[in-house]
Interface confidence: low
């Protein structure tokens, strides 16, 4: 045991991280026939190689390139759902609407979802005690750089109409500092993407305000239109009914506004 170890502000690597990544990889490749060719041991080796023995504040997108290459996956570019601060509902939606995909429905997103990891400079150890916090320690940490890399690639792949689910309960419905606001918005390709459609999810039962008029949504609209992409916005007043109607679109109550 080293006598001195860097204490970071964030939680340490998720317990059983190597086993979890390998297990998730095997699960994913078994379920998705188009990914059956993927060798999960190689995927783990590439994942490990991105951060092991490296200073956890000096990680670059380049470090993840071998993993990106192994995890290359084609998803229908017109079936992409982005999300910001409302992950659970986005995932519930794609669980029902099977032909749409969030980043976490791809191999690389699925592998890393909800996990934390980091190593230590010049040792092959995984740091289970603490990892750098994006705000308090450094932004170029293994987890942040991973999500920045895969989010950029995911947005770059999008085409036609791209959907984004936003949390209407937050003070900043669109947050320029979120992964969506800082990475994905800027990597949508205007020559491929025709429209970004925002779905603003209401939290309150009696909330009938038009959150598409929120100043932060207007900010998003101007950023998007400056990038030569059309913008549209819909209020989802009843997220529970919304999901129910995705499951059973023929239900008579689904013709009314949700």
């Amino acid at each position: 045991v080293p006598r001195w170890r860097q204490q970071w502000s964030g939680p340490g690597t998720t317990k059983r991280f190597p086993e979890t990544v390998l297990a998730r990889c095997v699960k994913y490749t078994e379920i998705h026939p188009e990914m059956r060719h993927v060798d999960c041991q190689s995927v783990w080796d590439a994942f490990k190689g991105a951060f092991i023995s490296k200073h956890p504040c000096n990680i670059t997108e380049e470090d993840y390139q071998p993993l990106m290459k192994l995890g290359t996956q084609t998803v229908p570019c017109n079936k992409i759902l982005l999300w910001s601060r409302i992950k659970d509902l986005a995932h519930q939606f794609t669980q029902v609407q099977r032909d749409m995909f969030t980043l976490e429905d791809t191999l690389l997103g699925y592998l890393a979802d909800d996990l934390t990891w980091c190593g230590e400079f010049n040792t092959s150890k995984i740091n289970y005690q603490s990892c750098p916090d994006w705000r308090k320690d450094c932004s170029n940490n293994p987890v942040s750089v991973f999500w920045k890399t895969v989010s950029r690639r995911f947005a770059e792949a999008a085409c036609d109409v791209v959907h984004v689910m936003l949390n209407g309960s937050r003070s900043k419905i669109f947050d320029k500092n979120s992964t969506f606001g800082s990475v994905e918005v800027h990597n949508l390709q205007p020559e491929k993407v025709q429209t970004l459609e925002a779905w603003v999810i209401h939290g309150g039962r009696e909330d009938s305000r038009d959150l598409c008029q929120d100043p932060t949504i207007k900010e998003l609209e101007s950023i998007i239109s400056k990038r030569n992409i059309q913008f549209s916005c819909k209020n989802i007043y009843r997220p529970d009914k919304f999901l129910q109607c995705v499951k059973n679109p023929e239900d008579s109550s689904c013709t009314s506004e949700i």
């Epitope: 059983r16 086993e19 979890t20 390998l22 297990a23 998730r24 095997v26 699960k27 078994e30 379920i31 999960c40 659970d88 995932h91 519930q92 669980q95 909800d114």
Partner: antibody, heavy 121, light 108 residues
Framework: EVQLLESGGGFVQPGGSLRLSCAAS????????MNWVRQAPGKGLEWVSS?????????WYADSVKGRFTISRDNSRNTLYLQMNSLRAEDTAIYYC?????????????WGQGTTVTVSS | EIVLTQSPGTLSLSPGERATLNCRAS??????LAWYQQKPGQAPRLLIY???NRATGIPDRFSGSGSGTDFSLTISRLEPEDFAVYYC??????????FGGGTKVEIK
Amino acid sequence: EVQLLESGGGFVQPGGSLRLSCAASGFTFTNYVMNWVRQAPGKGLEWVSSISISGGRYTWYADSVKGRFTISRDNSRNTLYLQMNSLRAEDTAIYYCAREMNTYSFPMDVWGQGTTVTVSS
Amino acid sequence: EIVLTQSPGTLSLSPGERATLNCRASQNVRSDLAWYQQKPGQAPRLLIYDASNRATGIPDRFSGSGSGTDFSLTISRLEPEDFAVYYCQQYYDWPPYTFGGGTKVEIK
């Protein structure tokens, strides 16, 4: 009809070995992840081991059996195995083999009737 | 590993009554939770998967709800054949799969 049928249980002394089998029928065996789950007398369910589809390149074990138990599959015989070595009294249980749902979620949708293993001197 | 805590340990009810069984996870398991029924001398049977989807052939008096850490299984009207032990299982953080300790639904 989709069916799993375990065999190979019995009485064994501590430190002994047993090999359990699970014969599958009514479905394409190679396409499914398979599991062993056990239940000690009067107790709840405990996951023991899993094996990946096809050739079973990947296997996983509960910490309590790691290094002592080995899961394997013979797809030509549609059979799942559990080789149990260095058996202990606490391994006494009904052992079930279970098929995992071949969907985006991984609950166990088909179970065998179980085979009883008793470890005692 | 994720610990699942089921409550109550035993539920004493009469046929025709409504039963609500709870399962709490020690950390977020999204919707990756299943419910099983086990009768004496029999293997477990899958009732509900992905927290709220009924398995094939399961009567609609069984329903599941919840996500994250708190889940429940409801039997709207207990039939005589529903008296059994019920287990929840998570398959989000894996390995290992973990099961709850079980809730016994017995005849009052």
